[in-house]
Protein backbone atom coordinates (compact mmCIF):
# COMPACT_ATOMS: atom_id res chain seq x y z
CA UNK A 1 0.00 0.00 0.00
CA UNK A 2 1.00 3.59 -0.62
CA UNK A 3 2.50 5.38 2.42
CA UNK A 4 0.07 7.95 3.85
CA UNK A 5 0.54 11.66 3.28
CA UNK A 6 -1.92 12.70 5.99
CA UNK A 7 -3.07 11.08 9.21
CA UNK A 8 -6.23 10.92 11.29
CA UNK A 9 -6.93 13.13 14.28
CA UNK A 10 -4.70 12.30 17.27
CA UNK A 11 -2.06 10.86 14.93
CA UNK A 12 1.13 12.21 13.37
CA UNK A 13 3.10 11.26 10.29
CA UNK A 14 6.64 9.98 10.73
CA UNK A 15 8.80 7.66 8.63
CA UNK A 16 5.92 7.37 6.12
CA UNK A 17 3.51 5.98 8.71
CA UNK A 18 0.86 7.34 11.02
CA UNK A 19 1.63 7.08 14.72
CA UNK A 20 -0.72 7.77 17.61
CA UNK A 21 -0.06 10.95 19.55
CA UNK A 22 0.47 10.63 23.29
CA UNK A 23 -2.57 11.51 25.38
CA UNK A 24 -2.59 14.54 27.70
CA UNK A 25 -0.49 13.83 30.78
CA UNK A 26 1.99 11.69 28.83
CA UNK A 27 5.15 12.41 26.82
CA UNK A 28 6.64 10.67 23.78
CA UNK A 29 9.42 8.18 24.42
CA UNK A 30 9.51 6.34 21.11
CA UNK A 31 7.67 6.65 17.79
CA UNK A 32 5.54 3.76 16.61
CA UNK A 33 7.07 1.24 14.22
CA UNK A 34 5.68 -1.35 11.81
CA UNK A 35 5.36 -3.67 14.82
CA UNK A 36 4.49 -1.53 17.84
CA UNK A 37 2.43 1.44 18.94
CA UNK A 38 3.83 4.80 20.03
CA UNK A 39 5.57 4.52 23.39
CA UNK A 40 4.38 7.18 25.83
CA UNK A 41 5.25 7.75 29.48
CA UNK A 42 3.31 9.65 32.17
CA UNK A 43 4.65 13.07 33.13
CA UNK A 44 6.49 13.18 36.45
CA UNK A 45 5.50 14.94 39.66
CA UNK A 46 5.19 18.72 39.08
CA UNK A 47 5.00 18.24 35.28
CA UNK A 48 2.17 18.37 32.76
CA UNK A 49 1.13 18.20 29.11
CA UNK A 50 -2.35 19.48 28.34
CA UNK A 51 -2.82 18.31 24.74
CA UNK A 52 -2.49 15.18 22.59
CA UNK A 53 1.18 15.51 21.75
CA UNK A 54 4.51 14.16 20.56
CA UNK A 55 6.57 16.16 23.06
CA UNK A 56 9.62 14.39 24.44
CA UNK A 57 9.56 16.50 27.62
CA UNK A 58 6.68 17.50 29.86
CA UNK A 59 6.30 21.14 30.93
CA UNK A 60 7.05 22.16 34.50
CA UNK A 61 4.12 23.33 36.59
CA UNK A 62 4.05 27.07 37.18
CA UNK A 63 5.56 28.08 40.55
CA UNK A 64 3.43 30.48 42.58
CA UNK A 65 6.20 32.51 44.21
CA UNK A 66 5.07 33.85 47.60
CA UNK A 67 7.83 36.49 47.37
CA UNK A 68 5.86 37.96 44.47
CA UNK A 69 2.61 37.83 46.44
CA UNK A 70 1.42 34.69 44.66
CA UNK A 71 -0.37 31.63 46.03
CA UNK A 72 -1.83 28.47 44.46
CA UNK A 73 -5.43 28.86 43.37
CA UNK A 74 -5.60 25.43 41.69
CA UNK A 75 -2.96 22.72 42.00
CA UNK A 76 -1.66 21.40 38.68
CA UNK A 77 -2.16 17.82 37.51
CA UNK A 78 -0.36 15.76 34.86
CA UNK A 79 -2.79 17.32 32.36
CA UNK A 80 -3.14 20.89 33.66
CA UNK A 81 -0.83 23.66 34.77
CA UNK A 82 -0.97 25.16 38.25
CA UNK A 83 -3.12 28.30 38.45
CA UNK A 84 -1.74 31.10 40.60
CA UNK A 85 -3.61 33.94 42.20
CA UNK A 86 -2.60 36.75 44.53
CA UNK A 87 -2.65 36.96 48.29
CA UNK A 88 -5.51 38.87 49.95
CA UNK A 89 -5.23 42.58 49.18
CA UNK A 90 -3.20 42.03 46.01
CA UNK A 91 -4.04 41.37 42.36
CA UNK A 92 -2.29 40.01 39.25
CA UNK A 93 -0.34 42.39 37.03
CA UNK A 94 -1.17 40.34 33.90
CA UNK A 95 -3.42 37.60 32.62
CA UNK A 96 -0.62 35.09 33.17
CA UNK A 97 -0.50 36.22 36.82
CA UNK A 98 3.26 36.18 37.13
CA UNK A 99 3.38 38.80 39.87
CA UNK A 100 1.07 40.81 42.09
CA UNK A 101 0.57 44.43 43.13
CA UNK A 102 -1.30 45.89 46.07
CA UNK A 103 -4.93 46.78 45.40
CA UNK A 104 -5.38 50.47 44.63
CA UNK A 105 -7.23 52.56 47.21
CA UNK A 106 -9.78 55.14 46.21
CA UNK A 107 -8.78 58.61 47.42
CA UNK A 108 -11.10 60.95 49.36
CA UNK A 109 -13.73 62.19 46.93
CA UNK A 110 -13.79 58.81 45.24
CA UNK A 111 -15.60 55.61 46.19
CA UNK A 112 -15.17 51.96 45.26
CA UNK A 113 -17.26 51.07 42.22
CA UNK A 114 -15.95 47.49 42.04
CA UNK A 115 -13.94 45.77 44.73
CA UNK A 116 -10.67 44.26 43.52
CA UNK A 117 -10.28 40.50 43.02
CA UNK A 118 -7.19 38.33 42.71
CA UNK A 119 -7.06 39.19 39.03
CA UNK A 120 -8.48 42.72 38.78
CA UNK A 121 -7.72 46.01 40.49
CA UNK A 122 -10.09 48.23 42.41
CA UNK A 123 -12.29 50.40 40.20
CA UNK A 124 -12.93 53.87 41.67
CA UNK A 125 -15.57 56.39 40.72
CA UNK A 126 -15.92 60.08 41.71
CA UNK A 127 -18.55 60.65 44.33
CA UNK A 128 -21.52 62.37 42.63
CA UNK A 129 -23.44 65.25 44.14
CA UNK A 130 -25.14 64.03 47.25
CA UNK A 131 -22.39 61.55 48.09
CA UNK A 132 -18.97 61.77 49.71
CA UNK A 133 -15.93 59.74 50.76
CA UNK A 134 -13.55 61.18 53.31
CA UNK A 135 -11.15 58.23 53.45
CA UNK A 136 -8.62 56.48 51.23
CA UNK A 137 -10.00 52.96 50.96
CA UNK A 138 -10.05 49.87 48.76
CA UNK A 139 -13.50 48.87 50.06
CA UNK A 140 -15.55 51.96 50.94
CA UNK A 141 -18.23 53.18 48.53
CA UNK A 142 -19.33 56.80 48.36
CA UNK A 143 -21.73 57.46 51.24
CA UNK A 144 -24.84 59.60 50.83
CA UNK A 145 -24.86 62.93 52.62
CA UNK A 146 -26.74 62.90 55.86
CA UNK A 147 -30.32 64.00 55.44
CA UNK A 148 -30.68 66.78 58.01
CA UNK A 149 -34.43 67.07 57.33
CA UNK A 150 -35.19 63.55 58.51
CA UNK A 151 -33.53 64.45 61.80
CA UNK A 152 -35.49 67.69 62.12
CA UNK A 153 -32.27 69.55 61.57
CA UNK A 154 -31.07 72.01 59.02
CA UNK A 155 -27.94 72.12 56.92
CA UNK A 156 -25.40 74.28 58.61
CA UNK A 157 -22.55 73.41 56.25
CA UNK A 158 -22.97 72.07 52.75
CA UNK A 159 -21.42 68.73 51.90
CA UNK A 160 -18.76 68.16 49.26
CA UNK A 161 -17.52 65.05 47.52
CA UNK A 162 -15.08 64.69 50.42
CA UNK A 163 -17.19 65.80 53.37
CA UNK A 164 -20.62 65.15 54.76
CA UNK A 165 -23.07 67.97 55.36
CA UNK A 166 -23.08 69.46 58.84
CA UNK A 167 -26.53 69.56 60.40
CA UNK A 168 -27.61 71.96 63.09
CA UNK A 169 -30.74 72.96 64.96
CA UNK A 170 -33.33 75.06 63.17
CA UNK A 171 -33.34 78.78 64.13
CA UNK A 172 -36.14 79.40 66.73
CA UNK A 173 -38.85 81.79 65.53
CA UNK A 174 -38.99 84.97 67.64
CA UNK A 175 -42.20 85.76 69.46
Amino acid sequence: PEPPTACREKQYLINSQCCSLCQPGQKLVSDCTEFTETECLPCGESEFLDTWNRETHCHQHKYCDPNLGLRVQQKGTSETDTICTCEEGWHCTSEACESCVLHRSCSPGFGVKQIATGVSDTICEPCPVGFFSNVSSAFEKCHPWTSCETKDLVVQQAGTNKTDVVCGPQDRLRA
Epitope: P1, S30, T33, F35, E37, E39
Partner: antibody
Protein backbone atom coordinates in the same frame (compact mmCIF):
# COMPACT_ATOMS: atom_id res chain seq x y z
CA UNK B 1 23.82 -4.66 7.77
CA UNK B 2 21.59 -5.52 10.70
CA UNK B 3 23.16 -7.88 13.21
CA UNK B 4 21.82 -9.39 16.44
CA UNK B 5 24.30 -11.55 18.33
CA UNK B 6 23.19 -13.51 21.39
CA UNK B 7 25.50 -14.81 24.11
CA UNK B 8 25.31 -16.22 27.63
CA UNK B 9 23.65 -19.57 26.97
CA UNK B 10 24.89 -22.77 28.50
CA UNK B 11 24.15 -25.64 30.83
CA UNK B 12 22.55 -24.77 34.17
CA UNK B 13 20.99 -26.83 36.97
CA UNK B 14 17.25 -26.54 37.78
CA UNK B 15 16.68 -23.58 40.11
CA UNK B 16 19.77 -21.86 38.75
CA UNK B 17 20.17 -18.52 36.97
CA UNK B 18 21.53 -17.34 33.65
CA UNK B 19 21.84 -13.96 31.95
CA UNK B 20 21.54 -13.74 28.20
CA UNK B 21 22.87 -10.79 26.24
CA UNK B 22 22.21 -9.57 22.72
CA UNK B 23 24.46 -7.10 20.91
CA UNK B 24 22.66 -5.14 18.18
CA UNK B 25 24.09 -3.18 15.27
CA UNK B 26 23.06 -1.84 11.86
CA UNK B 27 19.80 -0.14 12.93
CA UNK B 28 18.52 2.51 15.35
CA UNK B 29 18.27 0.18 18.33
CA UNK B 30 16.44 2.60 20.65
CA UNK B 31 13.61 3.06 18.15
CA UNK B 32 12.51 -0.56 18.27
CA UNK B 33 10.84 -2.80 20.78
CA UNK B 34 12.94 -5.91 21.30
CA UNK B 35 11.87 -9.45 22.14
CA UNK B 36 13.20 -12.77 23.29
CA UNK B 37 11.65 -15.78 21.58
CA UNK B 38 12.56 -19.38 22.40
CA UNK B 39 12.34 -22.70 20.60
CA UNK B 40 12.50 -25.97 22.52
CA UNK B 41 14.27 -28.82 20.66
CA UNK B 42 12.06 -30.01 17.79
CA UNK B 43 9.23 -27.64 18.80
CA UNK B 44 7.68 -24.39 17.57
CA UNK B 45 8.36 -20.79 18.52
CA UNK B 46 7.31 -19.35 21.89
CA UNK B 47 7.35 -15.63 22.71
CA UNK B 48 9.13 -15.02 26.03
CA UNK B 49 9.26 -11.26 26.59
CA UNK B 50 9.28 -7.82 25.00
CA UNK B 51 10.63 -4.45 26.04
CA UNK B 52 9.57 -1.16 24.44
CA UNK B 53 12.07 1.00 22.56
CA UNK B 54 12.61 3.40 25.44
CA UNK B 55 12.58 0.61 27.98
CA UNK B 56 9.53 1.96 29.80
CA UNK B 57 7.35 -1.10 29.32
CA UNK B 58 8.03 -4.82 29.63
CA UNK B 59 5.74 -7.73 28.84
CA UNK B 60 5.85 -11.45 29.66
CA UNK B 61 3.67 -14.54 29.30
CA UNK B 62 2.53 -16.23 32.54
CA UNK B 63 5.02 -19.06 32.01
CA UNK B 64 8.00 -16.79 32.82
CA UNK B 65 6.47 -13.89 34.80
CA UNK B 66 8.31 -13.40 38.08
CA UNK B 67 11.27 -15.51 36.93
CA UNK B 68 12.55 -13.72 33.82
CA UNK B 69 13.44 -10.03 33.51
CA UNK B 70 14.06 -8.30 30.19
CA UNK B 71 16.10 -5.09 30.11
CA UNK B 72 18.02 -2.97 27.64
CA UNK B 73 20.85 -0.46 27.53
CA UNK B 74 20.26 1.82 24.56
CA UNK B 75 23.63 3.52 25.05
CA UNK B 76 25.29 0.14 24.48
CA UNK B 77 22.81 -1.17 21.87
CA UNK B 78 22.29 -4.18 24.10
CA UNK B 79 19.38 -6.35 25.19
CA UNK B 80 19.40 -8.67 28.20
CA UNK B 81 17.35 -11.49 29.67
CA UNK B 82 17.90 -12.38 33.31
CA UNK B 83 16.54 -15.87 33.91
CA UNK B 84 16.09 -17.10 37.49
CA UNK B 85 14.54 -20.25 39.02
CA UNK B 86 15.19 -22.11 35.78
CA UNK B 87 13.25 -25.28 35.03
CA UNK B 88 13.82 -28.21 32.68
CA UNK B 89 11.02 -26.87 30.44
CA UNK B 90 13.02 -23.65 29.89
CA UNK B 91 15.52 -25.65 27.81
CA UNK B 92 15.51 -24.08 24.34
CA UNK B 93 17.34 -21.99 21.81
CA UNK B 94 16.73 -18.35 22.80
CA UNK B 95 16.50 -15.80 19.99
CA UNK B 96 16.90 -12.06 20.32
CA UNK B 97 14.55 -10.37 17.84
CA UNK B 98 13.36 -6.98 16.72
CA UNK B 99 10.50 -8.79 14.92
CA UNK B 100 12.04 -7.65 11.63
CA UNK B 101 15.42 -9.20 12.40
CA UNK B 102 16.49 -12.21 14.47
CA UNK B 103 19.78 -13.36 15.93
CA UNK B 104 21.22 -16.83 15.41
CA UNK B 105 20.11 -17.93 18.89
CA UNK B 106 21.86 -19.20 22.00
CA UNK B 107 21.15 -22.61 23.54
CA UNK B 108 20.06 -22.81 27.18
CA UNK B 109 20.02 -26.29 28.70
CA UNK B 110 18.49 -26.79 32.14
CA UNK B 111 19.43 -30.18 33.49
CA UNK B 112 20.74 -31.77 36.64
CA UNK C 1 -4.55 -16.04 25.83
CA UNK C 2 -5.10 -15.81 22.10
CA UNK C 3 -4.61 -19.18 20.40
CA UNK C 4 -3.31 -19.11 16.83
CA UNK C 5 -4.34 -22.22 14.86
CA UNK C 6 -2.50 -22.94 11.61
CA UNK C 7 -3.66 -25.28 8.86
CA UNK C 8 -2.42 -27.47 7.37
CA UNK C 9 0.28 -28.83 9.69
CA UNK C 10 2.18 -30.14 6.70
CA UNK C 11 2.03 -28.97 3.09
CA UNK C 12 3.75 -30.98 0.32
CA UNK C 13 4.19 -28.68 -2.69
CA UNK C 14 5.25 -28.88 -6.30
CA UNK C 15 7.70 -26.21 -7.50
CA UNK C 16 5.94 -23.70 -9.73
CA UNK C 17 2.55 -24.46 -8.17
CA UNK C 18 0.68 -22.12 -5.78
CA UNK C 19 0.41 -22.82 -2.04
CA UNK C 20 -1.72 -21.40 0.73
CA UNK C 21 -1.49 -21.50 4.54
CA UNK C 22 -4.30 -20.47 6.85
CA UNK C 23 -4.09 -19.04 10.36
CA UNK C 24 -7.07 -18.47 12.62
CA UNK C 25 -6.98 -16.57 15.92
CA UNK C 26 -9.28 -17.46 18.82
CA UNK C 27 -10.32 -13.79 19.07
CA UNK C 28 -9.89 -10.57 17.13
CA UNK C 29 -6.32 -9.34 16.97
CA UNK C 30 -7.13 -5.76 16.10
CA UNK C 31 -5.18 -3.56 18.53
CA UNK C 32 -7.07 -0.91 20.52
CA UNK C 33 -5.45 1.78 18.33
CA UNK C 34 -6.82 0.14 15.18
CA UNK C 35 -3.73 -1.63 13.84
CA UNK C 36 -3.54 -5.38 13.36
CA UNK C 37 -0.10 -6.63 14.38
CA UNK C 38 -0.13 -9.92 12.52
CA UNK C 39 3.00 -11.39 10.97
CA UNK C 40 4.20 -14.39 8.98
CA UNK C 41 7.66 -15.89 9.52
CA UNK C 42 9.59 -18.57 7.70
CA UNK C 43 12.17 -20.73 9.44
CA UNK C 44 14.31 -22.49 6.88
CA UNK C 45 16.03 -25.71 7.97
CA UNK C 46 18.89 -24.97 10.40
CA UNK C 47 18.27 -21.20 10.31
CA UNK C 48 16.68 -18.51 12.46
CA UNK C 49 13.15 -17.36 11.60
CA UNK C 50 12.86 -14.55 9.06
CA UNK C 51 10.05 -12.03 8.64
CA UNK C 52 7.97 -12.33 5.48
CA UNK C 53 4.81 -10.28 6.11
CA UNK C 54 3.88 -7.67 8.74
CA UNK C 55 0.58 -5.95 9.56
CA UNK C 56 -1.34 -8.68 7.72
CA UNK C 57 -0.38 -7.81 4.15
CA UNK C 58 2.85 -5.79 4.02
CA UNK C 59 5.81 -7.60 2.48
CA UNK C 60 9.04 -7.04 4.39
CA UNK C 61 11.97 -5.61 2.41
CA UNK C 62 13.72 -8.19 0.28
CA UNK C 63 10.82 -10.65 0.39
CA UNK C 64 9.90 -11.87 -3.13
CA UNK C 65 6.55 -10.69 -4.45
CA UNK C 66 5.36 -14.28 -4.85
CA UNK C 67 4.52 -14.07 -1.12
CA UNK C 68 1.33 -12.25 -0.18
CA UNK C 69 -0.70 -11.93 3.00
CA UNK C 70 -4.37 -11.20 3.49
CA UNK C 71 -7.14 -11.42 6.05
CA UNK C 72 -8.76 -9.49 8.87
CA UNK C 73 -10.26 -9.95 12.32
CA UNK C 74 -9.56 -13.61 13.05
CA UNK C 75 -8.82 -15.21 9.65
CA UNK C 76 -5.53 -14.77 7.84
CA UNK C 77 -3.88 -16.36 4.82
CA UNK C 78 -0.38 -16.56 3.39
CA UNK C 79 -0.20 -17.33 -0.33
CA UNK C 80 2.81 -18.31 -2.40
CA UNK C 81 1.92 -17.77 -6.05
CA UNK C 82 4.61 -20.12 -7.45
CA UNK C 83 6.55 -22.18 -4.94
CA UNK C 84 10.32 -22.40 -5.36
CA UNK C 85 12.65 -24.96 -3.83
CA UNK C 86 14.11 -22.32 -1.48
CA UNK C 87 10.69 -21.75 0.11
CA UNK C 88 10.81 -24.97 2.10
CA UNK C 89 10.75 -24.71 5.87
CA UNK C 90 8.30 -24.09 8.67
CA UNK C 91 5.95 -21.12 8.36
CA UNK C 92 4.65 -19.49 11.55
CA UNK C 93 1.90 -16.93 12.01
CA UNK C 94 2.18 -14.51 14.95
CA UNK C 95 0.00 -11.96 16.69
CA UNK C 96 1.64 -9.02 18.46
CA UNK C 97 -1.52 -7.08 19.23
CA UNK C 98 -2.43 -8.52 22.62
CA UNK C 99 -0.13 -9.69 25.42
CA UNK C 100 0.80 -12.47 25.70
CA UNK C 101 1.89 -12.48 22.07
CA UNK C 102 1.43 -15.87 20.45
CA UNK C 103 2.70 -17.92 17.53
CA UNK C 104 0.83 -20.50 15.53
CA UNK C 105 2.03 -24.10 15.77
CA UNK C 106 3.72 -23.93 12.38
CA UNK C 107 3.14 -25.35 8.90
CA UNK C 108 5.92 -27.48 7.39
CA UNK C 109 6.25 -26.84 3.67
CA UNK C 110 8.21 -29.49 1.78
CA UNK C 111 8.76 -30.37 -1.83
CA UNK C 112 6.79 -33.41 -3.06
Amino acid sequence: EVQLVESGGGLVKPGGSLRLSCAASGFTFSSYAMSWVRQAPGKGLEWVSEISGGGSYTYYPDTVTGRFTISRDNAKNSLYLQMNSLRAEDTAVYYCASRAYWGQGTLVTVSS
Amino acid sequence: DIVMTQTPLSLPVTPGEPASISCRSSQSIVHSQGNTYFEWYLQKPGQSPQLLIYKVSNRFSGVPDRFSGSGSGTDFTLKISRVEAEDVGVYYCFQGSHVPYTFGGGTKVEIK
